[in-house]
Every structure is written in structure tokens, then in C-alpha cells.
Amino acid sequence: HTAAQDNCTCPTNKMTVCSPDGPGGRCQCRALGSGMAVDCSTLTSKCLLLKARMSAPKNARTLVRPSEHALVDNDGLYDPDCDPEGRFKARQCNQTSVCWCVNSVGVRRTDKGDLSLRCDELVRTHHILIDLRHRPTAGAFNHSDLDAELRRLFRERYRLHPKFVAAVHYEQPTIQIELRQNTSQKAAGDVDIGDAAYYFERDIKGESLFQGRGGLDLRVRGEPLQVERTLIYYLDEIPPKFSMKRLTA
């Protein structure tokens, strides 16, 4: 990877081991846990990052109301199975043979079952709503400045094409970033909205995945934007299938 050539490191993924063992002695970086070679000029898939993480030695509503089908990642961390492209396999199972189906961002979208559970396809998450609450500031941020800064962040830091940042909503102290990306819209080489959202989530938590870069220093017109709570909602192209028992719980 040209991005990793000089001193054989991976700028976009610190959860790698890099070695001059690629073709012709070129630098090659492999994700921890899976051993898959990653492209260090772009973001690494969330599945490979989660696998690496598990293996590493751990009023007037202008805001969007998440749809009834929106998923929140309540299950937390698990050691996922990734396919040869680095994507989540549709069916995930734990060591005790409990299985469930996930969407393209690895969030469970069915009840848990046993090894007989079938997950026919990996359902794409096409809409992600990132819901942030910022720490109190002297005054509200200017909405258009905030919008511009967040769009710049996703474009420059996460290399996400601007067309996939659908909207930025602001109602102090709540900020919502909407990412939308249908299967038909995503071209080869495009960063996946799920991967961009995961990098952003880790940045916000002060757990940057980028090699050697300082943590995320978000400023709007010089004013620090400090996030104190993050909630991420995932909307799939096909609604999730949970039993009524869960829905009424």
C-alpha cells in the first residue's frame, strides 16, 4: 500500500500489524484477529475492526424521530465472523452455539436462536442516524457552521462522499447526523456509511482508530464541540424480525 510504504504502518487502522512481507517485499498490513490484508488508504471495515478489538491484548421538532424499525446496538461487543471481503457474515454465532442474524453494520436484527437459524442474506443498513448531545456552551452553535464542520469531518477524516451525508440537524444541545447510502448508490471504492459511523463513534469516545493521529478535535468557529452522549440508530433496507415478546418488553 502506498499509504503505508514509508515506515510500514497503516495510517487508517492502528489495529494492524504491518510487515515488509507483501509482493516484492512491499509493506503489507494485516488486521489483528482475522489476518486479512487491509487497504491503508481507506477505512477498514467495521467487522475486521471489531474482530481486531476482540483479539487485541479492550417542542417544535426539527429533530428526526427514529423509525419504529430503527435498531440500536444494545448487544455491545462480540467476536464476529467476517467474510473474505471483510463484511459481516449474515449469521453470527457465539461459542455456545447461540446464533442470530445481523445487518451490514453487525447489529443484531432477529431474535437469538440455535445453529438451525437461517440468515439468507446480509441486509444492508441504508440509513444511520447519529444522535449526539454536546456539553453546555456559552451559546448555541451556528447551525450552518456546525453543518459545514461535520460535513467536512466526514469528507476529510473518514473519506465519505458528501452525497452520503443526508442532513445535519441541530436543536441545542442535540445534534443529529443522517447518513444515507442505498446499495445502488454505493460505487466501488466508496466508503461505507457503517464504517464511517463506526470510526466517528470511536473518535467521539476518545478511542481513535487512526494511527498516530491525535484524537478528534472538533471545533466550530474555534469553539470546541465536546460530545457527552452518543446514540446511533440503524435503519435497514428490510425491517428487522423480532418476536412480539421483545417489542412489548
Epitope: 510500514c8 512481507d21 517485499g25 494485516r30 482475522s34 486479512m36 491484548p57 473474505p84
Partner: antibody
């Protein structure tokens, strides 16, 4: 030139443990993955696991977890594989190999015989 | 785990003739990030360690005679020896080093007819 020299043959009793060594020379030991491979008599090749000596990251084939323990001593550029609770089915030639696309470097193999 | 299946298990070819060994993987070995296939071919003679012939599915290791060639992508791969020589008698293995655990094919024994 790159060389991997392994320790000599071992004959051990069932239930015992053994530690095989692999001394590397001719390259920077700490910046390449070093893998271990098993070949039972008349059988094919099985990947046991690998170690990255520079950071001590280790990966195991699930089949060999609890059986093999990989370590490395960077001061002597030597990798080790300890095999425990030995049984007759552990009788095999064990190879160390430098991994990667240009992974043409293998040790000569260490024959381990488990016999009472 | 990725399962590597070689065919045939054994092969007898006349000197100077072409020998072809196939290897099929249960999952794609093509890395979409760098468009490289993580597939290697090894030759092993009795009492010796395996010798790397081909890596990246088609790149010949330095010092390997040009009668050896590799082809294929994704899940289907082929090792071809264009003109068999006596010293090519050996067991040949394909290996995936795409995702842990790395896996080998069961081997193909090549003999002179």
C-alpha cells in the same frame, strides 16, 4: 541469506511436553510473521499458528489451542513452540516458516515422536 | 475456516508433457482492497520442507523455473508445469493465507508416467 534452523529430533513419552526452537538469521526477526506447520507421517500440511516477534501478537488455529504455545525471544532471534499433553497423534514433523507473500523460507523441520 | 480442495489426488504425466493441478477454495481468496489473490503453491519432496513456487496465485518465486505457472482468481486456481522434468516429481500443495487460520489443500502427488 535468510535461514531458519530448528532444534533436533525429539522422542518423548505420552503426557509429557516438549519445546521446539527455530533460530532465525539473515533478516530482521522482529518485523516478519513466523508460522508453525505440522506434518504427520504420510499426511499433508496443517497450519498451527503464527507469532509476530516485534509485538508478540500470536494467532492459533482453533484446533491447536491448548496444545501449542508460541513464544519468541527477540534477543536471540529465536522462536519457540511448546507442545503439551503429548499423545501418539502429535507424532509429526514440525516446521517453522517465515510468512508473507515472499514466504519461501522454511526450517528443515523437527521430527517429534511420541511413544511409550 | 476456508477449505482448500485439490484435484486430482495423484497424477502421472510423461516427461516433457504438461501437468495441471487444480485447487478450489470454499471462499474467495481475492482481497478486494488490493485485488490480490492470497493463494500460494508449494512443492515438497520426501524428507524436505515445502518449497514456495508461486504466490499471489500467479507470481513465480525468484529462482523457480518458468515452466511453473499459476493462474486463477477468487475460488478456482491452477498450477501448470508446461513440460514435466524428472526433478518435478513431488507432492504439490496449494495454501490460502487470506484469513486465519491459513489452510492447505490435501496435496497432489505428481509422478512420471
Amino acid at each position: 541469506q535468510v535461514q531458519l534452523v530448528q532444534s533436533g529430533p525429539e522422542v518423548v513419552k505420552p503426557g509429557a511436553s516438549v519445546k521446539i526452537s527455530c533460530k532465525a538469521s539473515g533478516y530482521t526477526f522482529t518485523i516478519y510473521w513466523l508460522g508453525w506447520v505440522k506434518q504427520a507421517p504420510g499426511q499433508g500440511l496443517e497450519w498451527i499458528g503464527n507469532i509476530f516477534p516485534g509485538s508478540a501478537y500470536i494467532n492459533y488455529n482453533e484446533k491447536f489451542k491448548g496444545k501449542a504455545t508460541l513464544t519468541a525471544d527477540t534477543s536471540t532471534s529465536t522462536a519457540y513452540m511448546e507442545l503439551s499433553s503429548l499423545r501418539s497423534e502429535d507424532t509429526a514433523v514440525y516446521f517453522c516458516a517465515r510468512e508473507g507473500s515472499n514466504s519461501g523460507y522454511w526450517g528443515q523441520g523437527t521430527l517429534l515422536t511420541v511413544s511409550s | 475456516d476456508i477449505v482448500m480442495t485439490q484435484s486430482p489426488d495423484s497424477l502421472a504425466v510423461s516427461l516433457g508433457e504438461r501437468a495441471t493441478i487444480n485447487c478450489k477454495s470454499s471462499q474467495s481468496l481475492l482481497n478486494s482492497g488490493n485485488q490480490q489473490n492470497y493463494l500460494a503453491w508449494y512443492q515438497q519432496k520426501p524428507g524436505q520442507p515445502p518449497k514456495l513456487l508461486i504466490y499471489g496465485a500467479s507470481t513465480r518465486e525468484s529462482g523457480v523455473p518458468d515452466r511453473f505457472s499459476g493462474s486463477g482468481s477468487g475460488t478456482d486456481f491452477t498450477l501448470t508445469i508446461s513440460s514435466l522434468q524428472a526433478e518435478d516429481v513431488a507432492v504439490y500443495y496449494c495454501q490460502s493465507d487470506h484469513i486465519y487460520p491459513y489452510t492447505f489443500g490435501q496435496g497432489t502427488k505428481l509422478e512420471i508416467k
